[in-house]
Amino acid sequence: VPRWRQQWSGPGTTKRFPETVLARCVKYTEIHPEMRHVDCQSVWDAFKGAFISKHPCNITEEDYQPLMKLGTQTVPCNKILLWSRIKDLAHQFTQVQRDMFTLEDTLLGYLADDLTWCGEFNTSKINYQSCPDWRKDCSNNPVSVFWKTVSRRFAEAACDVVHVMLNGSRSKIFDKNSTFGSVEVHNLQPEKVQTLEAWVIHGGREDSRDLCQDPTIKELESIISKRNIQFSCKNIYRPDKFLQCVKNPEDSSCTSEI
């Protein structure tokens, strides 16, 4: 590694990043007929153009606009599922409940899910050694700015009843500093979104507490209400049973509280 290369605190670009993005794009457009018109090479070029040759602490939402334009996608605005710190269950849910969508069920979210990337100022190289960490280095890094941009757009598109899955096992069930708390909550449009319904997912098998009483949930309720959006909260005591009942709603055990 050359001496002059900036050392960041976070992990470097995911190996085979260009190939991964391109392969994911091809796979997604094959599976989703409404996105068959998308030219994946152009998508990769726009993605690359957002961060290559740019200082990885000086990325802006504007840098991603060409990519956003190419990845424009219409999802049913009343079928949006947001999540915070509980990605796996949210994705398991939308895999079963196919008419609901997380951000990662959209093309742009699917492309970038679990990947890291950054470039270097004035060189066309991708940095596979290290990338800026949001806390330790800078917040305007390529990955953070990407997720902030797509999350904002996703929230802005939502309408009617929006659902959010929250992790009841965490000390802060609702965290103002999460993407949901800092971006999505503030970009739901009161003229379109009537109600935010929070699903608080319990971790412990014997946990019968009403986590809708948690102070952070009441904080979320307050923030949402001040934005003229109504609020609903439900405990999901048994996530395993919850998923099972989504798969088989006719099951006799699915009439009781989950």
């Epitope: 009843v161 109600t195 309720e221 109504q230 609020f231 609903s232 909260c233």
Partner: antibody, heavy 119, light 107 residues
Framework: QVQLKQSGPGLVQPSQSLSITCTVS????????VHWLRQSPGKGLEWLGV???????DYSAAFMSRLNITKDNSKSQVFFKMNSLQADDTAIYYC?????????????WGAGTTVTVSS | DIQMTQSSSSFSVSLGDRVTITCKSS??????LAWYQQKPGNAPRLLIS???SLETGVPSRFSGSGSGKDYTLSITSLQTEDVVTYYC?????????FGAGTKLELK
């Protein structure tokens, strides 16, 4: 099942105050808000105010100066007090439960308390 | 305050009719509209919220539509028990306000 039972006087003297208690069952006041409304032949249905699950309140500006809504979660009771009643406050007064945690419409209503303001 | 206007205070209907009740708000209420049914001597009963969402247990012959300032409640194949009074309510702004009601009466 979900019920709201109202208790309060039928007759109130002009300039006196009206107190109604709404005792709920089948749900917890820590999970739902309770709205107060009234209905009279002259003015139709009017919204007066709401107490949310956390205890905060919102009042109609027209009644804010003389209305107070409180509650006791442990007793499952909501208390409504309106001061300085006049003849045009004669109406049926209702308490009603919010459909979801914090919404502005109601799915279950009390039977109503018929209040006449007269000397 | 937002004014809610129900165009007809009463209208004559026949059993089996398709009935449409209209409600107009003085400003855009962004689908924040509820419909209630009230039988004589009873409290109002919630039928629809969010302009279109039917409450659990409400018969499917009831439906809501509309946007902006103009909303309608439709009843297909009117039944005897439906011949009562209907109110709309906006909840875009406080104070919450109601229409004056539309009373259905048999011809």
């Amino acid at each position: 099942q979900v019920q709201l039972k109202q208790s309060g006087p039928g007759l109130v003297q002009p300039s006196q105050s009206l107190s109604i208690t709404c005792t709920v069952s089948g749900f917890s006041l820590t999970n739902y808000g309770v709205h107060w409304l009234r209905q009279s032949p002259g003015k139709g249905l009017e919204w007066l105010g709401v107490i949310w699950r956390g205890g905060s309140t919102d009042y109609s500006a027209a009644f804010m100066s003389r209305l107070n809504i409180t509650k006791d979660n442990s007793k499952s009771q909501v208390f409504f007090k309106m001061n300085s009643l006049q003849a045009d406050d004669t109406a049926i007064y209702y308490c009603a439960k919010t459909t979801l945690t914090r919404v502005w419409y109601c799915d279950v209503w009390g039977a109503g308390t018929t209040v006449t303001v007269s000397s | 305050d937002i004014q809610m206007t129900q165009s007809s205070s009463s209208f004559s209907v026949s059993l089996g009719d398709r009935v449409t009740i209209t409600c107009k708000s003085s400003e855009d209420i962004y689908n924040r509209l509820a419909w209630y049914q009230q039988k004589p001597g009873n409290a109002p009963r919630l039928l629809i919220s969010g302009a279109t969402s039917l409450e659990t247990g409400v018969p499917s012959r009831f439906s809501g539509s509309g946007s902006g300032k103009d909303y309608t409640l439709s009843i297909t194949s009117l039944q005897t028990e439906d011949v009562v009074t209907y109110y709309c309510q906006q909840y875009w702004n406080t104070p919450l306000t109601f229409g004056a009601g539309t009373k259905l009466e048999l011809k």
